[in-house]
């Protein structure tokens, strides 16, 4: 006899990276007929929603109108059908950004390289942080984590044209509180000398739309909850 229901999916709209003082909605999708959803924050009950009518609703939303560092952390949700509770969802890491300072991002040997060259990004922030995050803008969140007193190295190794794109970095004051994003660095990777055609890449956003990027639901993440859970879970681990 089944003792628990399947775990629900959890995700954040428009994005799990939320600039401070902006709004975010945490979504929890369970099953039709669920009479109660509970949202847990850092292991404690945070909010409850009882959908009406439960047989016509399989998703609830928990709205956070004003993001701040106290609201950043790990969320999970569960739901109940009758007296039977579900397994807890995967953990959602909700991150507050635009905290304190702005790092600088640079690239070695430079912003235009030939396929096969070794490329390293450097993220520098002079204030009190030792963890840095490098993100490639695009449809999926390519995130690397690095450490250093004021500057972290992010070796990409020998690059291919798939590494083309626009990169930003953040300083991280803790796992869930990040700095303002750096200015973008666009990496151009050409083929060999004879063939400088450029390969397709993730769609990138213009530098002046980074704020919009943070506040735009990434394509497919709502539809592909497994990908969303995977991205959110592995981002900071």
């Amino acid at each position: 006899q089944q003792q628990t229901l399947p775990k629900p999916f959890i995700w954040a709209e428009p994005h799990f990276m939320v600039p401070k003082e902006k709004q975010v909605t945490i979504c929890c999708q369970g099953n039709y007929g669920a009479v109660e959803y509970q949202l847990h924050f850092e292991g404690s009950l945070f909010a409850v929603d009882r959908p009406k009518p439960p047989e016509r609703i399989n998703k609830v939303q928990f709205y956070i109108p004003d993001m701040n560092s106290r609201m950043a952390g790990q969320y999970s949700c569960i739901y109940r059908v009758g007296e039977l509770w579900s397994e807890p969802s995967n953990l959602l890491d909700l991150v507050v950004t635009e905290m304190y300072d702005t790092p600088t991002l640079s690239v070695h040997p430079g912003p235009e390289v030939i396929s096969g060259e070794k490329v390293t990004f450097y993220c520098r922030l002079d204030t009190a942080t030792s963890m840095f995050l490098l993100l490639k803008e695009g449809r999926s969140s390519h995130v690397q984590r690095g450490y250093g007193k004021v500057q972290a190295e992010f070796p990409l190794g020998p690059v291919t044209t798939a590494h083309r794109g626009t990169y930003r970095c953040f300083g991280s004051y803790n796992n869930h509180a990040w700095s303002f994003p750096s200015e973008p660095v666009k990496l151009l990777v050409t083929g060999d000398i004879e063939n400088t055609s450029l390969a397709p890449e993730d769609p990138t956003f213009p530098a002046d739309t980074w704020g919009t990027y943070l506040l735009t639901t990434e394509t497919g993440l709502q539809k592909d909850h497994a990908l969303w859970d995977h991205t959110a879970q592995n981002l900071l681990r």
Partner: nanobody, 122 residues
Framework: DVQLVESGGGSVEAGGSLRLSCAAS??????MGWFRQAPGKAREGVAC??????????DYADSVKGRFTITQDNAKNTVYLQMNSLKPEDTAMYYC???????????????WGQGTQVTVSS
Amino acid sequence: DVQLVESGGGSVEAGGSLRLSCAASGYRQRTMGWFRQAPGKAREGVACIYTGPTTTFTDYADSVKGRFTITQDNAKNTVYLQMNSLKPEDTAMYYCAANLAYPLTIIPDTRWGQGTQVTVSS
């Protein structure tokens, strides 16, 4: 190993010009630049240049934009800093740097010259 030799420093009145040169021996340097340090102050970036496969990129500190120009002669493996409209606050020891990250970032493998003094009087 890379050796960097600067030249072209000197004294000039405000509004004048100087041209600094930095010759790099050894392998060709793709990202080279200039930093400066005034007495009692921290070292600060001035300008850098990166030669990519098809494009040359330059970056300048806000305080020198429109007044200083960095160029590179790949054949001579030399970088130049043309400094126009000099101000007293440009007075400093100017250091050539090679193997930077772009834009204008010191990394563990950055190499340094001995420096050349620039003095701008009012």
